[in-house]
């Protein structure tokens, strides 16, 4: 239960008052307001929306609301020289061209400034050559092609289907394979759920729909020209050749109507197995090149996008804490969209807006939170998490000393089946306790708690009677806070049924069809799922900012550390002979985990018993909880990824969206059997075990009695 004794308020100002103030109708109204025109990062429209949000947050009652601007590298198509892909005949004549843009959704025919589909940060170029179909362009797909099928992608244009992994990883893999261009497409197998109509009559992707997105491999760097430092007025910028994470080959996305035209002519090798076949009426031949009759035809890309340093604007709102104003709980989500942003991000931004309004209402009635709450509307998330990262770089010294928690608030929905939560283990108990107090919005669970419907629909694979909570990966604005700065972080949204809907993300993701109507007609007509997400996100912020003792349970970290240690040990034990030969031992890691478990247990006992009326002791215990996440940060970062500094979690090197545990050890072990120098490779495994063991032990000691 929340505790409000220290905040000079009447009894009615508790969590219930905050939650009761949240209204579905307001979220609906805000979503409509935020989605009528595009709000692409770096555009005047998005600047105007930033100023509107600043003004409204002030009206809602926040103490201060400021714009924080940065000049970062963005990418746009050339307005007079459009991007497209051709099939050319032996004379070089273009016999087929892909669409230049998506057919407009009904009601939006006269909207200007809809950016055509493009892969942000693609270099310019007009490569031509034979096509190779590379499935999802995952690491394992290229292994299959190169090692098993002996197909060489060098000098080829590859075509990959969207899904499974972050598109930037696909491009990186294609580059490493020697490809000279990448075509990304949405296959109906991944973006068209059976039995559902395509937009505007359902939530499926039409054949002309295309997913936009950046193709960077930033590894947490933020603005490619100013890694590690804010892109402010006096910034030193790298030359474009030294910029972080930019792709080196042209890349362009297409829809499945156009993909059909490219794939139907494919010849060469047959697909290796059924997992390489999508749902188009094409053979899914791998290539290289077109079949017999069309063997003289080639594919040509025409990419003319430009990278430009452009001003972006974050909105930062402050609600000052009454007791611990120097402790920050942050709620942040982005504002920029690819087009209308009906789901991504405005379903999240509308929820943040209503949460701010509710907090503001309480504040106007005389209430203040115990700790300071910061609200953020980030810019340029779609271009590589730039707004949040630049702000965190600018404020890193404050954040590492004062940051209690970060709650992310991008899309509130990606389905309407059940809750989905990814967070630090420190927040598991907070999430469990909160969802037990909230009503489920799900049909068939009337009068039941959110915890109950969530657990039933998405059970934990390890613990019966508990819901699944996933690891944090990346691909969203929590990245800099968690992976770089070590601030406890979490995210929550409503999701689809992963059992029955195996498509990737939601079908209309990053397309022009992500409109207000998509949400209002097909996902959440009553906005009850949005309201539930507002209650979860807002409730977490309320509790983190207001409870006397921080609602973190360090024992949950102990449990997962043991699980992760077991998992990485199992992976290593696939090579028993090498472990013996190179004297690889995990004893130090298991010992550190054991110590952590014991110390965490004792700390939790002390937490129950200490004198909470003693402000010094209270602050001391809370600081130990706050700084525990920070203790998992290695200042040197992970190998070749200096901005991923968390030793327990990092985005997977093969899929930015996914979280990997003990990533240093995992990466050292990955594909180790193919390393040319096994002695060196196993030496790195041993070094990574040492780093992990040391870090876990060091973190444990931060929980020991201070004297």
């Amino acid at each position: 239960k929340s505790s409000n004794e220290a905040t000079n308020i009447t009894p009615k100002h508790n969590m219930k008052a905050f939650l009761d103030e949240l209204k579905a109708e307001n979220i609906k109204k805000f979503l409509y307001n935020f989605t009528q025109i595009p709000h692409l990062a770096g555009t005047e429209q998005n600047f105007q929306l930033a100023k509107q949000i600043q003004s409204q947050w002030k009206e809602f009652g926040l103490d201060s609301v400021e714009l924080a601007h940065y000049d970062v590298l963005l990418s746009y198509p050339n307005k007079t020289h459009p991007n497209y892909i051709s099939i050319i005949n032996e004379d070089g004549n273009e016999i087929f061209n892909t669409s230049l843009f998506e057919p407009p959704p009904p009601g939006y025919e006269n909207v200007s400034d809809i950016v055509p589909p493009f892969s942000a940060f693609s270099p310019q170029g007009m490569p031509e050559g034979d096509l190779v179909y590379v499935n999802y362009a995952r690491t394992e797909d290229f292994f299959k092609l190169e090692r098993d099928m002996k197909i060489n992608c060098s000098g080829k244009i590859v075509i990959a289907r969207y899904g499974k992994v972050f598109r930037g990883n696909k491009v990186k893999n294609a580059q490493l394979a020697g490809a000279k261009g990448v075509i990304l497409y949405s296959d109906p197998a991944d973006y068209f759920a059976p039995g559902v109509k395509s937009y505007p009559d359902g939530w499926n992707l039409p054949g002309g729909g295309v997913q936009r997105g950046n193709i960077l491999n930033l590894n947490g760097a933020g603005d490619p020209l100013t890694p590690g430092y804010p892109a402010n007025e006096y910034a030193y910028r790298r030359g474009i050749a030294e910029a972080v994470g930019l792709p080196s080959i042209p890349v362009h996305p297409i829809g499945y109507y156009d993909a059909q035209k490219l794939l139907e002519k494919m010849g060469g090798s047959a697909p290796p197995d059924s997992s390489w076949r999508g749902s188009l009426k094409v053979p899914y031949n791998v290539g290289p090149g077109f079949t017999g009759n069309f063997s003289t035809q080639k594919v040509k890309m025409h990419i003319h996008s430009t990278n430009e340093v452009t001003r972006i604007y974050n909105v930062i709102g402050t609600l000052r804490g009454a007791v611990e104003p120097d402790r920050y709980v942050i709620l942040g989500g982005h504002r920029d969209s690819w087009v209308f942003g009906g789901i991504d991000p405005q379903s999240g931004a509308a929820v943040v807006h209503e949460i701010v309004r509710s907090f503001g209402t309480l504040k106007k009635e005389g209430w203040r939170p115990r700790r300071t709450i910061l609200f953020a509307s980030w810019d340029a998330e779609e271009f590589g998490l730039l707004g949040s990262t630049e702000w965190a770089e600018e404020n890193s010294r404050l954040l590492q000393e004062r940051g209690v928690a970060y709650i992310n608030a991008d899309s509130s929905i990606e389905g309407n089946y059940t809750l989905r939560v990814d967070c630090t283990p420190l927040m598991y108990s907070l999430v469990h306790n909160l969802t037990k107090e909230l009503k489920s919005p799900d049909e068939g669970f009337e009068g039941k708690s959110l915890y109950e419907s969530w657990t039933k629909k998405s059970p934990s694979p390890e613990f019966s009677g508990m819901p699944r909570i996933s690891k944090l990966g990346s691909g969203n604005d929590f990245e800099v806070f968690f992976q770089r700065l070590g601030i406890a972080s979490g995210r929550a949204r409503y999701t689809k049924n992963w059992e029955t809907n195996k498509f990737s993300g939601y079908p209309l993701y990053h397309s022009v069809y992500e409109t207000y109507e998509l949400v209002e007609k097909f996902y959440d007509p009553m906005f009850k799922y949005h309201l539930t997400v507002a209650q979860v996100r807002g409730g977490m912020v309320f509790e983190l900012a207001n409870s006397i003792v921080l609602p973190f349970d360090c024992r949950d970290y102990a449990v997962v550390l043991r699980k992760y240690a077991d998992k990485i040990y199992s992976i290593s034990m696939k090579h028993p002979q090498e472990m013996k030969t190179y004297s690889v031992s995990f004893d130090s890691l298991f010992s550190a985990v054991k110590n952590f478990t014991e110390i965490a247990s004792k700390f939790s006992e002390r937490l129950q018993d200490f004198d909470k009326s003693n402000p010094i002791v209270l602050r001391m215990m809370n600081d130990q909880l706050m700084f525990l996440e920070r203790a998992f940060i290695d200042p040197l970062g992970l190998p070749d990824r200096p901005f991923y500094r968390h030793v327990i979690y990092a985005p997977s090197s093969h899929n930015k969206y996914a979280g990997e545990s003990f990533p240093g050890i995992y990466d050292a072990l990955f594909d180790i059997e193919s390393k040319v120098d096994p002695s060196k490779a196993w030496g790195e495994v041993k070094r990574q075990i040492y780093v992990a063991a040391f870090t876990v032990q060091a973190a444990a000691e931060t929980l020991s009695e201070v004297a």
Partner: antibody
């Protein structure tokens, strides 16, 4: 065999109303978007309105939106066009047509029904 | 709204002639274009969709081509039953407008 049969046309005075019907057979009616397309005497084709599979979304030529209403009854395999405040310039053969989605061509056409607006 | 401009508005040709009708869109409609044939007193019939795909049962002497803003319908060898009026129509956005028509008459 696909059949679309329009009815309800005739002579009507300016300012009057008329309700056109279209009876469909030979295909799964609810799998198709339906539309009305008109052709004034000696002139070209002009799209009037469309309705989606279940009738939840309707689309109109802007200039006709306030006067015409398209509807459907999937249980009866029928399409309708309610025309109010008719004007002389609404005189035309009105065709019922079917397409298999919002972004699709008109695959099926009826034989048309003539509406004459005259005093 | 996207306007469709057909040319010529009429043409005279003989049986066996190659006939080409063009259609220009006021905006880029990719290949979201259909061609219809209408004979006097009859309803229109679909000939071509997606700019180049022949509808079921349409003779192979008909062909469509083009993309973006410029489209053509070609009849490789005009037959007596082909004398009719031909319309192009885009289905890129609402409203889905038709061209003004091309009347193919016997020379």
């Amino acid at each position: 065999e696909v059949q679309l049969v329009e009815s309800g046309g005739g002579l009507v005075q300016p300012g009057g109303s008329l309700r056109l019907s279209c009876a469909a057979s030979g295909f799964t009616f609810s799998d198709y978007y339906m539309a009305w397309v008109r052709q004034a005497p000696g002139k070209g084709l002009e799209w009037v309105a469309s309705i989606n599979y279940d009738g939840s979304s309707t689309y109109y030529l802007d200039s006709l939106k306030s006067r015409f209403t398209i509807s459907r009854d999937n249980a009866k395999n029928s399409l309708y066009l309610q025309m109010n405040s008719l004007r002389a310039e609404d005189t035309a053969v009105y065709y019922c047509a079917g397409s298999d989605g919002y972004w699709a061509w008109f695959a099926y056409w009826g034989q048309g029904t003539l509406v004459t607006v005259s005093s | 709204d996207i306007q469709m401009t057909q040319s010529p508005s009429s043409l005279s040709a003989s049986v066996g002639d190659r006939v080409t009708i063009t259609c220009r869109a006021s905006g880029n409609i990719h290949n979201y274009l259909a061609w219809y044939q209408q004979k006097p007193g009859k309803s229109p019939q679909l000939l071509v969709y997606n700019a180049e795909t022949l509808a079921d049962g349409v003779p192979s002497r008909f062909s469509g081509s083009g993309s973006g803003t410029q489209f053509t319908l070609t009849i490789s060898s005009l037959q007596p039953e082909d004398f009719a009026t031909y319309y192009c129509q885009h289905f890129w956005s609402t409203p889905p407008t038709f061209g003004g028509g091309t009347k193919v008459e016997i020379k």
